[in-house]
């Protein structure tokens, strides 16, 4: 056969679906690889062909579209399973072609089992809610296109294993779940089960997401440098190790990049000749506020090093701050005999 533009196995689109549930999978060619859509391709006389390779096999096979009750079917650029089975797991290929043109891409499909608490190997999306921020909603994800707007599905929401029924601050509202006042206790996995009829059968769509309650923007502040501060003086003798921690608190801010860095005499440590090392550690509070600590270390400090300016800097979307460490050379203690002699008025 003639050459085909092969986009290979698109592992970025590792698709996971639940066993025994419908799944609709769009050919990724039109979404991510080609500059035209299916309608344009179809109008131009191109045909979309599907085939697959079973898990742990090398043989490409055509997809069987003649199964009972049309369990697997194709509609435009969508491959439908009504429903999926565990052994549908494999690599699926969609190929667009005519006599002069060919383009194809493969993608992995994994059919996973869930237990009665909706635990599974499925990778869960995370939805962040602001703590004590007023009414916030999550929406049952990825259910568009499964049933027409004329069909009114029933939706049951669960927190963990249990139906959300008559909860204090969590209210199911169809496809949405409203949190009246989000609290740390609302952290957890939430599942919507959407039930809809189709051709005399009833199908479930199960969708689970993780809710994480995070710091509110109402409470967000610029970075706070706890150390260095005015109360601690780093007093060293030449030859000793100098250790200065820079500890910074960052309020949680959605999509904010938190940065901490040291300057020595106004330059980044990399840009000067001192033998300096910097180690960073990061910790998070329950609401994802962040504390970053960068410890500046000079193994054997010189008297010149002790005269330099050491400044800790921090930046977030809320602003930038800096604080200088108080570093000085320790004055050697006077020799004992001299001190005594002076004390007795000796000359």
């Amino acid at each position: 056969s003639e050459r085909c533009d092969d986009w290979g196995l698109d592992t970025m689109r590792q698709i996971q679906v639940f066993e025994d549930e419908p799944a609709r999978i769009k050919c990724p060619l039109f979404e991510h690889f080609l500059k035209f859509n299916y309608s344009t391709a179809h109008s131009a006389g191109l045909t979309l062909i599907w085939y697959w390779t079973r898990q742990d096999r090398d043989l490409e096979e055509p997809i069987n579209f003649r199964l009972p009750e049309n369990r697997i079917s194709k509609e435009k650029d969508v491959l439908w399973f009504r429903p999926t089975l565990l052994n549908d797991t494999g690599n699926y290929t969609c190929m667009l072609r005519n006599t002069t043109y060919c383009s194809k891409v493969a993608f992995p499909l994994e059919v996973v089992q869930k237990d009665s608490c909706f635990n599974s190997p499925m990778k869960l999306p995370v939805h962040k809610l602001y703590i004590e921020y007023g009414i916030q909603r999550i929406t049952c994800p990825n259910v568009d296109g499964y049933f027409p707007s004329s069909v009114k599905p029933t939706i049951t929401w669960y927190m963990g294993c249990y139906k959300i029924q008559n909860f204090n601050n969590v209210i199911p509202e169809g496809m949405n779940l409203s949190f009246l006042i989000a609290l740390i206790s609302n952290n957890g996995n939430y599942t919507c089960v959407v039930t809809y009829p189709e051709n005399g059968r009833t199908f479930h769509l199960t969708r689970t997401l993780t809710v994480k309650v995070v710091g509110s923007p109402k409470n967000a502040v610029p970075p706070v440098i706890h150390s260095p501060n005015d109360h601690v003086v780093y007093e060293k003798e030449p030859g000793e190790e100098l250790l200065i921690p820079c500890t910074v608190y960052f309020s949680f801010l959605m999509d904010s990049r938190n940065e901490v860095w040291w300057t020595i005499d106004g330059k980044k440590p990399d840009d000067i000749t001192i033998d300096v090392t910097i180690n960073e550690s990061i910790s998070h509070s329950r609401t994802e506020d962040e504390t970053r600590t960068q410890i500046l270390s000079i193994k054997k400090v010189t008297s010149e090093d002790l005269k330099r300016s050491y400044v800790c800097h921090a930046r977030s979307a809320k602003g930038e701050v800096a604080k200088a460490a108080k570093v000085k050379q320790k004055v050697p203690a006077p020799r004992y005999t001299v001190e005594l002699a002076c004390g007795f008025g000796a000359t």
Epitope: S116, C117, Y162, K163, Q165, T202
Partner: antibody, heavy 120, light 107 residues
Framework: QVQLVESGGGVVQPGGSLRLSCAAS????????MHWVRQAPGKGLEWVAV????????FYTDSVQGRFTISRDNSKNTLNLQMNSLRAEDTAVYYC?????????????WGQGTLVTVSS | DIQMTQSPSSLSASVGDRVTITCRAS??????SNWYQQKPGKAPKLLIY???SLQSGVPSRFSGSGSGTDFTLTISSLQPEDFATYFC?????????FGGGTKLEIK
Amino acid sequence: QVQLVESGGGVVQPGGSLRLSCAASGFTFSSHGMHWVRQAPGKGLEWVAVIWYDGSNKFYTDSVQGRFTISRDNSKNTLNLQMNSLRAEDTAVYYCAREGLRAGYYFDFWGQGTLVTVSS
Amino acid sequence: DIQMTQSPSSLSASVGDRVTITCRASQRISFYSNWYQQKPGKAPKLLIYAASSLQSGVPSRFSGSGSGTDFTLTISSLQPEDFATYFCQQSHSTPLTFGGGTKLEIK
């Protein structure tokens, strides 16, 4: 402890009406879906109707759709089944049952049942 | 509607026996299957929900398994109080449906 007590059963003529009630106690009634299930003499179990915890959804088996109405009063912890246009085949013991809070529609507690006899 | 086909319809066994009752759904229902026990003149009692979860207070000799279309209730060692009728039920979607029942009798 959980208690469900049905009442309102009796003998009624075909075409007649009857209203069954179920008094619930020992649990938070407004947190559970509630169901009616029936059992004809010497036969198996047949699900009749469900009402969601907040009354927002009601579903019925096909044979009673349009004739029976399920309702609840969360302030009084009661479940009702209004049965109209009764037929001989509606003769059964009617159980009210509490829906469990885990996945799916299942019945974790049942009342002792009330007998409805439709006969001329 | 989803049909639940239960077998056998009756079963004779002795105390101490291991007993298995099966139920087949007419369409795939994932784990949405439950088992009940009923004694004459009494209301049914939940034994197993979500295919394999043991209801609180039910003896551990009862177990459930299965997924998709085929489900099993197993009693590992029959006790005298276990002689009763057993029903499976699908909790996947309305109308909810029960199997025809299995009458477990003393041999």
